[in-house]
Interface confidence: low
């Protein structure tokens, strides 16, 4: 932005500038150019020897300017167009300035003036051009500064040229008021802070409903000596509930929201939310729908899942395998987990109680992601009810629970766990164990054994203890051994069939 302090051409001859010496040299003339009257100061003393003619402007108030720009439009006639080449003719003139705090009026003193430059034309007007009224107009610009006093004068020294001064324009530059990145930068005088720092740093202020992002830099711009803004640093962002529309922040329309200061536009309220009002920072969930604390506000509101589907309990001795399928309604979420709880009931008394402490789960039962789990260490002749609950990230926000139950009665003891304790060429010492809680129900243990490959005959031994030595066996022979608990009600669960081999007669080490 240019702020004009002086414009000779615009004043249409109303500026009476001082000429020195008075009545000689520079003179104000009117001419017609393009059917318009134009005013100019001209001088053309080219045959009168050395010249020293001065033209001084009126006093110009500096305003806020520190550096001024002087734009001159002028024409210079070719010295060769004068008789004899006019030996004293020149084709340049000099430009001066003087600062002062007051207007000296007609008191003109050359010594107060400082030379800015010698002004030479790029093109001179030759005779043929002049006769055809085709003058060559030159434009030159000079910069002066820094200025410190209240005002200044310019002066033009003629040293014997034929010059017409058509325009003198003095201005200073401002970086204009500007909106950039939602920040308003004030109109700023274009000044160089120093030779090494030719840019002035200007802080901007965020427009209404815009803020500096958290941890970010405030908006800064640099105003150059040429009145141009450069190198923006930092930015402002529309605050929550507002979006950028051109250079302003506008409230989100009803039905839209914005939850944080960012460059993104307002977003439409997600599914299962109530339509927001103007300038909303979030959209409330519909009744029955919720947001987990970690859910982004742009995510649809969700609800707890329905109960798991198709829960089955498959009894395997003193174990139960629970299997189920995912809920029909996931509530719109993927983060489904299952928890299993257990209740045992004594058939005789009908008394029931929790059984978490006495059973063993194949994996922790309270954050299952798979849809099956095995429960072991179940007591025989006991009724068990298992509840499988489906939960997701918003289940904790409601009191109701979504679960399915399955019941199973344990009639058998758990199969004994069998191992080979010792062996020889003719004997096998076998031991076994069952859970302590089930031992009181066992009357005897039945050990069945036979040679591998001999399907026609087998031997049975009964004992009340937890071990047996099987004698009179053949050396280097594999025997199939199974242990079964016998209860008052009949046979309990049998162990799996184990293969144990007697030692050979050649090497009888264990």
């Amino acid at each position: 932005k240019e702020v004009v302090l002086l414009d000779f051409a615009a004043m249409k001859g109303e500026l009476g500038w001082l000429t020195h010496p008075y009545g000689k040299g520079w003179d104000l003339m009117q001419n017609i150019m393009d059917d318009m009257p134009i005013y100019m100061y001209s001088v053309c003393n080219v045959v009168s020897g050395d010249q020293d003619n001065w033209l001084r402007t009126n006093w110009v108030y500096r305003e806020e300017a520190e550096r001024i720009f002087i734009e001159l439009k002028f024409t210079v006639r070719d010295c060769n167009s004068f008789p004899g080449g006019a030996s004293s003719c020149k084709e340049t003139f000099n430009l001066y300035y003087a600062e002062s705090d007051v207007d000296y009026g007609t008191n003109f003193q050359k010594r107060q003036f400082t030379k800015i430059d010698t002004i030479a034309p790029d093109e001179i007007t030759v005779s043929s051009d002049f006769e055809a009224r085709n003058v060559k107009l030159n434009v030159e610009e000079r910069m002066v500064g820094p200025l410190t006093r209240k005002g200044f004068y310019l002066a033009f020294q003629d040293i014997g040229a034929c010059v017409a001064l058509l325009s003198v324009r003095v201005y200073y530059k401002k970086c204009p008021e500007m909106l950039q990145s939602l920040a308003r930068f004030p109109e700023t005088i274009a000044v160089a802070v120093s030779d090494t720092q030719p840019l002035a740093t200007v802080a901007g202020t965020c427009v209404d409903h815009a803020v500096v992002p958290y941890g970010g830099e405030g908006p800064l711009m640099h105003c150059t000596v040429d009145g141009e803004w450069l190198v923006p640093i930092g930015q402002c962002l529309c605050q929550e509930g507002y979006e950028k529309v051109e250079d302003a922040c506008r409230a989100c329309s009803p039905g839209f929201f914005k939850s944080e200061a960012s460059e993104s536009p307002c977003l439409e309220c997600p599914e299962h939310t109530l339509p927001s009002t103007e300038g909303a920072t979030s959209c409330q969930c519909e009744e029955g729908y919720f947001r987990a604390p970690e859910d982004p506000l742009s995510m649809s509101c969700t609800r707890p899942p329905s109960a798991p589907n198709y829960l089955t309990a498959i009894g395997m001795g003193a174990k139960v395998e629970l299997r189920w399928t995912a809920p029909k309604d996931t509530g719109g979420r993927q983060d489904i987990v299952y928890s299993v709880t257990c209740e045992q009931c004594w058939p005789e008394s009908g008394e029931c109680g929790p059984c978490e402490a006495s059973v063993r789960y194949s994996e922790p039962p309270h954050a299952l992601t798979r849809t099956s789990v095995t429960v072991s260490d179940l007591e025989p002749h006991m009724n068990y009810t298992f509840a499988v609950e489906a939960r997701n990230g918003v289940s904790g926000l409601v009191t109701s629970r979504s679960f399915r139950t399955a019941s199973v009665s344990i009639n058998q003891t758990e199969p004994p766990k069998v191992r080979l304790e010792d062996r020889s060429t003719t004997s096998l010492s076998v031991t076994w164990s069952i859970p302590v809680s089930q031992q009181s129900r066992v009357w005897k243990y039945e050990v069945t054994y036979r040679k591998k490959g001999d399907a026609n005959s087998y031997n049975v031994r009964r004992t009340e203890g937890f071990s047996v030595t099987l004698d009179d066996l053949a050396p280097d022979t594999t025997y199939l051994v199974q242990v079964q608990a016998l209860t008052q009600e009949g046979q309990g669960a049998g162990s799996k069939v184990h293969e144990f081999q007697t030692l050979s007669t050649e090497g009888s080490a264990n």
Epitope: R250, P254, F256, P265, C266, E268, E271, L274, P275
Partner: antibody
């Protein structure tokens, strides 16, 4: 010419079902949300249901929730209202109406229901 | 009972000015939601008359104007003409209702 034409109305017994259709022409149907609005004889306008342009958001008035189903087929430029378990109080002229929601580029204003069909009459009576 | 309250009827002589009010609450008009007005000529479908509180669709004469303040809105008709005789409905949105869209009960305008 921008036009909405409803069809499918008629006389039905209480507890019965009807399916209303609304054929759209003269504009890009898939860019607009749509509504069904009804007017009982001698009464005012009552909003019935809303469906967004992509069918991702659907709303119903409490009076029809669980009985009516709104749907659309953008490929066929058609809007539908499946009405089940009809009651005598559902007797009305049913209008489909185009609804332009303010998007975040054009922002304000909210254009309201700017195009209406001529209506189709539903009578529920034994 | 409508969520938005309108007078059941208003009347005016040709050339006169009439206004129709539409009163809501803090959950609808007072919550910042837009108000639209519809005109229903006898035996015809409703027609959008004013949208976004005060905007006229093309083709609607400038005799019709809308405004909104606080929890109320109003429709003004100047230079009343015989063809203005119709039912007028206001419509807005209510955050407390499942579907959010609400109409006024309607106002019958009679040109005397």
């Amino acid at each position: 010419e921008v036009q909405l034409v409803e069809s499918g109305g008629g006389l039905v017994q209480p507890g019965g079902s009807l399916r209303l259709s609304c054929a759209a022409s003269g504009f890009t149907f898939s860019s607009y949300s749509m509504n069904w609005v009804r007017q009982a004889p001698g009464k005012g306008l009552e909003w019935v249901s809303y469906i967004s342009s992509s069918s991702s958001t659907i709303y119903y008035a409490d009076s029809v929730k669980g009985r009516f189903t709104i749907s659309r087929d953008n490929a066929k430029n058609s809007l539908y209202l499946q009405m089940n378990s009809l009651r005598a109080e559902d007797t009305a002229v049913y209008y489909c109406a185009r609804y332009r929601f303010p998007d975040f580029w054009s922002g304000y204003p909210n254009y309201g229901m700017d195009v209406w069909g001529q209506g189709t009459t539903v009578t529920v009576s034994s | 009972q409508s969520v938005l309250t309108q007078p059941p009827s208003v009347s005016g002589a040709p050339g006169q000015r009439v206004t129709i009010s539409c009163t809501g609450s803090s959950s609808n008009i007072g919550a910042g939601y837009d108000v639209h007005w519809y005109q229903q000529l006898p035996g015809t479908a409703p027609k959008l008359l004013i949208y976004g509180n005060s905007n006229r669709p093309s083709g609607v004469p400038d005799r019709f104007s809308g405004s909104k303040s606080g929890t109320s809105a109003s429709l003004a008709i100047t230079g009343l003409q015989a063809e203005d005789e119709a039912d007028y409905y206001c419509q807005s949105y209510d955050s407390s209702l499942s579907g959010h869209v609400v109409f006024g009960g309607g106002t019958k305008l009679t040109v005397l």
